[in-house]
Interface confidence: medium
């Protein structure tokens, strides 16, 4: 039975040539997290492996961080980096659990972030 | 190149156990979940279950909860399954197989063992 | 759990035609915008081999004679042109919930 959320900073935006903080929690669960994984629609950006820590896929290396956390850092962001992002909570009892975050960069200076939302 | 290596043949009686290993080579173990299907003979494939490397945990079908017990040894990179309390109907032809932790892959098990075949007979 | 039902059970198409298998699942399979259906061709003796991943995805090495289509609960595999080689069973299975399930086969003989 998978009782877990995952809380996420929703649809946000930021400036081009800025960068974001992407963040999920899982909670409402004891499960045991093994690994997490961030893919960005059809590409894998990173993983956070429990055993072996912190792997960025090599295409992303400069300009993807580590953390904080769990989470996964973007930098010196393009337009080209709008769209879905995922963080997939691999965890033991409960299984997979899966995050969704919409980013949006922006030309403009106006970039204001997206209220917080739990996906089920 | 990726390999998963089984262990050969058994022939085994009623009310016995079995267990089967699955060694896996050419990549990360614990990137990967390993699974175990069944397949009866001429029949379709029935997935078992399957354990996550990193910690043994286990996710069962839960028509083989009480038949069989999947464990890992990291240190070797092998996959066991246990069957037990055996009977006729569990003679059939077992696969290890591994699919990567990628949600962008869909979990597919795209690397398979070459099958060990049991045969359950007094 | 989720069934699989694959149709036809088996097919028979002559060298160089189209070979077209269905796969039906008892709900839907997407989750997140991605269909979590792979397709598997298995020769006698041998385990089976992923051909397709995540409904339309062509696993490497595969040639591209075989695609995959479909959503939610409706699925496709079609080869095209079927060649000599292409003569196994071929499986789809789900796996956006526990347990994973698989179809009942469908085998495919060249005429």
């Known amino acids: 039975m998978m009782t877990g959320t995952i809380e996420t900073t929703g649809n946000i935006s930021a400036e081009k040539g800025g960068s974001i903080i992407l963040q999920c929690h899982l909670s409402s669960t004891t499960a045991q997290v093994t690994q997490v994984n961030w893919e960005q629609q059809d590409q894998l950006l990173a993983i956070c492996n429990a055993d072996l820590g912190w792997h960025i896929s090599p295409s992303f290396k400069d300009r993807v961080a580590p953390g904080p956390g769990l989470g996964l850092t973007l930098q010196s962001l393009t337009v080209n980096d709008t769209g879905e992002y995922f963080c997939i909570y691999h965890t033991y009892p409960d299984g997979t659990y899966t995050g969704r975050i919409f980013l949006e960069v922006l030309e403009s200076s106006v970039a204001e972030h997206g209220a917080r939302f739990q996906i089920p | 190149e990726v390999q998963l290596q089984q262990s050969g043949p058994d022939l085994v009686k009623p009310g016995a156990s079995v267990k089967i290993s699955c060694k896996a080579s050419?990549?990360?173990?614990?990137?990967?979940?390993m699974h175990w299907v069944k397949q009866s003979h001429g029949k379709s494939l029935e997935w078992i279950g399957r354990?996550?490397?990193?910690?043994?945990?286990?996710s069962y079908n839960q028509k083989f909860k009480d038949k069989a017990v999947l464990t890992v040894d990291k240190s070797s990179s092998t996959a066991y399954m246990e069957f037990r309390s055996l009977t006729s109907e569990d003679s059939a032809v077992y696969y290890c197989?591994?699919?990567?932790?990628?949600?962008?892959?869909?979990?597919?098990?795209?690397?398979w063992g070459q099958g060990t075949s049991v045969t359950v007979s007094s | 759990d989720i069934v699989v039902t694959q149709s036809p059970a088996s097919l028979a198409v002559s060298l160089g035609q189209r070979a077209t298998i269905s796969c039906r699942a008892s709900?839907?399979?997407?989750?997140?915008?991605?269909?979590?259906i792979h397709w598997y061709q298995q020769k006698p003796g041998q385990p089976p081999k992923l051909l397709i991943y995540?409904?339309?995805n062509l696993e490497s090495g595969v040639p591209a004679r075989f695609s995959g289509s479909g959503s939610r609960t409706d699925f496709t595999l079609t080869i095209d042109p079927v060649e000599a080689d292409d003569a196994a069973t071929y499986y789809c299975?789900?796996?956006?919930?526990?347990?994973?399930?698989f179809g009942g086969g469908t085998k495919l003989e060249i005429k």
């Open positions: 197989a591994s699919s990567p932790l990628l949600r962008l892959r869909g979990y597919a098990m795209d690397d």
């Open positions: 050419g990549y990360s173990f614990t990137g990967y979940y």
């Open positions: 354990v996550n490397p990193n910690n043994g945990g286990t």
């Open positions: 709900e839907s399979v997407d989750s997140y915008g991605k269909s979590f």
């Open positions: 995540v409904a339309s």
């Open positions: 299975q789900q796996n956006n919930e526990d347990p994973w399930t």
